[in-house]
């Protein structure tokens, strides 16, 4: 009464599973099974995952930890979070780069490479959406520039230049004769 009851020892439950002869308590995350328990409902002998390995969940049968993944330098990946005993390395892209999935149905575990983000400023355009999970989305031309073909062209600095209609609308000039 007042104390916390330990989970009932039931081989079909979540806390204990039959390992070898007996129902044993599993190993916590970050630990692997060295030896099963030596009595009914006992604790297994669990050891901490060695460096560069991990186990993310409580487990009953893992006798070795999973090797931490190495981020793919060829694909310009970097480690966003280092591997720990309970979690794998989280690979991603450095600031200014975005994830380009290598498969069409992209999920978190899909292979990917990092692409440099578009620099809207260098293209003389507004940045509409900052680059993170996908490439930068550039908007309209910056002030002092007008749309010409696929790019932004600088407004003429003198009245001598030729200024088409779009130029005139943006730059405030009329074509001079």
């Amino acid at each position: 009464q007042g104390g916390t009851r330990s989970p009932r020892c039931d081989c079909a439950g979540d806390f204990h599973k039959k390992i070898g002869l007996f129902c044993c308590r599993g190993c916590p995350a970050g630990h692997y099974l060295k030896a099963p328990c030596t009595e009914p409902c006992g604790n297994s002998t669990c050891l901490v995952c060695p460096q560069d390995t991990f186990l993310a969940w409580e487990n009953h049968h893992n006798s070795e930890c999973a090797r931490c993944q190495a981020c793919d330098e060829q694909a310009s990946q970097v480690a966003l979070e280092n591997c720990s005993a309970v979690a794998d390395t989280r690979c991603g892209c450095k600031p200014g780069w975005f994830v380009e999935c290598q498969v069409s149905q992209c999920v978190s575990s899909s292979p990917f490479y990092c692409q440099p983000c578009l620099d809207c400023g260098a293209l003389h355009r507004h940045t509409r959406l900052l680059c993170s999970r996908r490439d930068t989305d550039c908007g309209t031309c910056l002030p002092g520039f007008y749309e010409h073909g696929d790019g932004c062209v600088s407004c003429p600095t003198s009245t001598l230049g030729s200024c088409p209609e779009r130029c005139a609308a943006v730059c405030g000039w009329r074509q001079m004769f």
Epitope: I19, G20, L21, P36, T38
Partner: antibody, heavy 123, light 111 residues
């Protein structure tokens, strides 16, 4: 009827190796844990090894750990005890036994035994 | 490890006598309301034979003159009326936890 036929005993020098076998019949071998128990001349019984059914985990007392290995071949209905780095104190009659589980209490008792095989470690 | 202490180490009795052997464990062998204790009979030159399991349950085919009782750490094995064929050494053994351990044995002789 349940039968456990043992073989492999004999004379071996200290530091040597020996492999004991136990051929089972008359029951579904793969469904039972199995054990080895030994008895030194004129002495009592000493548990030596157990192997579980299914996942084949093995268990040993400290006296033989890292020297003995227990294994099973369910296809051949056979149990084995590989004994390495043998010492004079390992001299004994070795018995294989079936471990029967009773009820839902994870409780085992050795309900059938082989006739035993003598292992003598001497130079 | 759980130590099993059997007494007496040997005893002599007459045919028809009631014979009692005791076994004490160094810690409780109870689990979930069951005593994980058994008794074996070993005749000279033969393999051991299971007589009693779970402290008081008589194994199938074993004569009813053999019985067992007790719980926790203290256990008793009884032969209600000793027969000539009962000449053997008797062992208690616990299965509560590994390593499994046996008592040192009680050698029973006929007077």
């Amino acid at each position: 009827q349940v039968q456990l036929q043992q073989s492999g005993g004999g004379l071996v020098q200290p530091g040597g190796s020996l492999r004991l076998s136990c051929a089972a019949s008359g029951f579904t071998f793969s469904s039972y844990a199995m054990s080895w128990v030994r008895q030194a001349p004129g002495k009592g019984l000493e548990w030596v090894a157990t192997i579980s059914d299914g996942d084949s985990y093995s268990y040993f007392p400290d006296s033989v750990k890292d020297r003995f290995t227990i294994s099973r071949d369910n296809a051949r209905n056979s149990l084995y005890l590989q004994m390495n780095s043998l010492r004079a104190e390992d001299t004994a009659v070795y018995y294989c036994a079936r471990d029967r589980i009773y009820g839902s209490v994870q409780y085992y008792a050795m309900d059938y035994w082989g006739r035993g095989t003598l292992v003598t470690v001497s130079s | 490890d759980i130590q099993m202490t059997q007494s007496p180490s040997s005893l002599s009795a007459s045919v028809g006598d009631r014979v009692t052997i005791t076994c004490r464990a160094s810690e409780s062998v109870e689990f979930s309301g069951t005593s994980l204790m058994q008794w074996y009979q070993q005749k000279p030159g033969k393999a051991p034979k299971l007589l009693i399991y779970a402290a008081s349950n008589v194994e199938s085919g074993v004569p009813s003159r053999f019985s067992g009782s007790g719980s926790g750490t203290d256990f008793t094995f009884t032969i209600s009326s000793l027969q000539p064929e009962d000449i053997a050494t008797y062992y208690c053994q616990q299965s509560r936890k590994l390593p499994y351990t046996f008592g040192q044995g009680t050698k029973l002789e006929i007077k």
